[in-house]
């Protein structure tokens, strides 16, 4: 006899990276017929929702109108059908950005490189932080972590056309509080002609969506959003 229900999916809209004082919605998708959803924050009960009518709803939303450092951290959700509870969802790391200062980002040997050259990004922030994050725009939300007193290096290794795209970095004051983003650096990789058509760059977001960072314009399955957020967050843990 089944003791628990399958775990729900959890994700943040528009994104798990939220500028301070901006709004964010945490979504939890379970099963139709669920009578109660619970959102847990850092291991403690944070909010409860009871959908009506439960048989017509398989997703609930928990709205945070004003993001701040106290709201940043790890969230999970569970749901109940009758007396049976689900497994907890994966952890959602909700990050507050636009804290304190703006780092600078440079790329070596330069923003225009030839396929096969080794490329390194450098991120610098003079205020008290020792962890840095490099993000590439695009649906896959690549995140790299680096460490250093005032700057960190992010070696990409020999590049291919798949590395083309726009990069930004953040300083991280803790796992869930990040600086403003750096100005973007667009990496252009030329050469490797035979692979160009096989290795397009990630679909990137229109430039103006960076106002709230990596806002997704995709309209695919909600599960995809959850997996996408979860992939990028693996580095936070």
């Amino acid at each position: 006899q089944q003791q628990t229900l399958p775990k729900p999916f959890i994700w943040a809209e528009p994104h798990f990276m939220v500028p301070k004082e901006k709004q964010v919605t945490i979504c939890c998708q379970g099963n139709y017929g669920a009578v109660e959803y619970q959102l847990h924050f850092e291991g403690s009960l944070f909010a409860v929702d009871r959908p009506k009518p439960p048989e017509r709803i398989n997703k609930v939303q928990f709205y945070i109108p004003d993001m701040n450092s106290r709201m940043a951290g790890q969230y999970s959700c569970i749901y109940r059908v009758g007396e049976l509870w689900s497994e907890p969802s994966n952890l959602l790391d909700l990050v507050v950005t636009e804290m304190y200062d703006t780092p600078t980002l440079s790329v070596h040997p330069g923003p225009e490189v030839i396929s096969g050259e080794k490329v390194t990004f450098y991120c610098r922030l003079d205020t008290a932080t020792s962890m840095f994050l490099l993000l590439k725009e695009g649906r896959s939300s690549h995140v790299q972590r680096g460490y250093g007193k005032v700057q960190a290096e992010f070696p990409l290794g020999p590049v291919t056309t798949a590395h083309r795209g726009t990069y930004r970095c953040f300083g991280s004051y803790n796992n869930h509080a990040w600086s403003f983003p750096s100005e973007p650096v667009k990496l252009l990789v030329t050469g490797d002609i035979e692979n160009t058509s096989l290795a397009p760059e990630d679909p990137t977001f229109p430039a103006d969506t960076w106002g709230t960072y990596l806002l997704t314009t995709e309209t695919g399955l909600q599960k995809d959003h959850a997996l996408w957020d979860h992939t990028a967050q693996n580095l936070l843990r």
Partner: antibody
């Protein structure tokens, strides 16, 4: 055209510091790394470090880290390299070289360290 | 640090000869390799970047090849102005390092 013009020759005593300048023209100064390389008499080339004028990001060769400081004055498109605690083995020609790929080089500055 | 072993350290050749200079890196440097030419009392001049890309204005008799750890500079037909010292330079990983140089002399 791209030009990198370096300051004139210097003679220093052991223990002193030297500050060499490299004035750039003919391109967007803040868009490219600037490297510093030295060459002792009759010897090969040795990379000292680099700075990015747009971000003040530096990367120094560990060998020189405790003694070198690179700075930028964007108003005059000039990069500076200061080397302290000089010793006789620092006698060399010091070059600035633009870009991560070292595409253009200054004419060199001779630094002589002698008591 | 990545060591760049350049050979030969010196080479005597005649005008019209085909000359090959090699550089071996102590680890993979991708294609992040330059070849530089230096004449006495002058600053180095870059000839080739990213292993095989020829700089503007450099004669086509110069060519570069290689990958991983082994790289080659070839001068297909030596001219009088080619007698100089040549250096390889890896810019893949800091500290960036140069080969020891090859002094090309007239036979």
């Amino acid at each position: 055209q791209v030009q990198l013009v370096q300051s004139g020759a210097e003679v220093k005593k052991p223990g002193a510091s030297v500050k060499v300048s490299c004035k750039a023209s003919g391109y967007t100064f803040t868009s490219y790394w600037m490297n510093w390389v030295r060459q002792a008499p009759g010897q090969g080339l040795e990379w000292i470090g680099m700075i990015h004028p747009n971000s003040d990001i530096t990367n120094y060769n560990e060998k020189f880290k405790s003694r070198v400081t690179m700075t930028v004055d964007t108003s005059t498109s000039t990069v500076y390299m200061e080397l302290s605690s000089l010793r006789s083995e620092d006698t060399a020609v010091y070059y600035c070289a633009r870009h991560g790929r070292f595409d253009y080089w200054g004419q060199g500055t001779t630094v002589t360290v002698s008591s | 640090d990545i060591q760049m072993t350049q050979s030969p350290s010196s080479l005597s050749a005649s005008v019209g000869d085909r000359v090959t200079i090699t550089c071996r890196a102590s680890q993979d440097i991708g294609s992040s390799l330059n070849w530089l030419q230096q004449k006495p009392g002058k600053a180095p001049k870059r000839l080739i970047y990213a292993t095989s890309s020829l700089d503007a204005g450099v004669p086509k008799r110069f060519s570069g090849s290689g990958s991983g750890t082994d790289y080659t500079l070839t001068i297909s037909s030596l001219q009088p102005e080619d007698f100089a010292t040549y250096y390889c330079l890896q810019y893949a990983s800091s500290p960036f390092t140069f080969g020891g140089g090859t002094k090309l002399e007239i036979k």
